[in-house]
């Protein structure tokens, strides 16, 4: 499946649009809002009742090359006594982002957009039971 | 830019860094993953720090629909189902990359844009600053 064309009738394709070969698109990877920073509450990964660790994955043929993934530390959640309570479950919260993948075919290079699922952090949930046999 | 290993047999003219502008195949790899968090799981309702999901739509962006989480309570839900204000529900934020049509309205010309989204909420012990 492809990126949808602009579907709204009030959109007219401007004359200023750059010419693009069929089946591809022009992508400027100079990021808008590059310097925007996350303003999350301090150390929430350690203070959470469903704490998590971070792992950095690095791939030189991906842009951006660095993607940070979270992993829940526990199966249960941390109770008021600081102990793991397995009547509740720590679960990962995930979000999709886009990356640009560089592919080498012989000496030629092509670029592909890719959706990547990033685990952002964890939350504590009531477990659900699906099938009792 | 990002340095990458070059095939030793290839001409030296190849740039080791990602160029500023690239031509990209219109097909997106892993395109068919579920983008609606309400359908993919019900964690937002089952969490001790539950959240509501708000639809943010922008036809000049890909993906055009992004779901934003807003924590329902200041506190967290305790074992009795009540809000406990000794704990705090806080949003988990993430920077993601999206495509922005540039120039505007152009069907096949985009620029990467970094946006900040709240993905969900988690229950944390509050930081209490003591006043001397």
């Amino acid at each position: 499946r492809k990126i949808p064309k602009v579907g709204h009738t009030f959109f007219q394709k401007p004359e200023s649009c750059p010419p693009v070969p069929g089946g591809s698109m022009k992508l400027d990877i100079g990021i808008i809002n590059e310097n925007q920073r996350v303003s999350m509450s301090r150390n929430i990964e350690s203070r959470s009742t469903s704490p998590w660790n971070y792992t950095v994955t690095w791939d030189p043929n991906r842009y951006p090359s660095e993607v940070v993934q979270a992993q829940c530390r526990n199966l249960g959640c941390i109770n008021a006594q600081g102990k793991e309570d397995i009547s509740m479950n720590s679960v990962p919260i995930q979000q999709e982002t886009l990356v640009v993948r560089r592919k080498h075919q012989g000496c030629s290079v092509s670029f592909q957009l890719e959706k990547v699922l990033v685990t952002v952090g964890c939350t504590c949930v009531t477990p659900v039971i699906h099938h009792v046999q | 830019g990002i340095t990458i290993p070059r095939n030793p047999g290839c001409p030296n003219s190849e740039d080791k860094n990602f160029p500023r502008t690239v031509m990209v195949n219109l097909n997106i790899h892993n395109r068919n993953t579920n983008t609606n968090p309400k359908r993919s799981s019900d964690y937002y309702n089952r969490s001790t720090s539950p959240w509501n999901l708000h639809r943010n739509e922008d036809p000049e962006r890909y993906p055009s629909v992004i779901w934003e989480a807003k924590c329902r309570h200041l506190g967290c839900i305790n074992a009795d189902g009540n809000v406990d204000y000794h704990m705090n529900s806080v949003p988990i934020q993430q920077e993601i990359l999206v495509l922005r049509r540039e120039p505007p309205h152009c069907p096949n010309s985009f620029r990467l844009e970094k946006i900040l989204v709240s993905v969900g909420c988690t229950c944390v012990t509050p930081i209490v600053h003591h006043v001397a």
Partner: nanobody, 118 residues
Amino acid sequence: EVQLVESGGGLVQAGGSLRLSCGASGGTFSSYATGWFRQAPGKEREFVAVLRWSDGHTAYADSVKGRFTISRDGAKNTMYLQMSSLKPEDTAIYYCTTATRPGEWDYWGQGTQVTVSS
């Protein structure tokens, strides 16, 4: 569809030990996590032990900590619950369960009765 079958339950004296086994047929334990829970007549269901497959992380209910041990044998497609220093209050039906994704326990066995006499 995965079928879970428990075995190893029985009658034991207080202070004694039992080892429960849980086998998977029609599939494998290639899930996110596995665990044991128990239910005594007129009491709430209680998870007693859980194990995450990716890293072997284990956790226990306070009531059994230090006495019960959850383990697995991937080659035999079997999970175990070693129970020692058993108490009369451990009397219950014990069920094994698997979660194919976090927070969602998909499959349960039919249960095995454990009775601890004083």
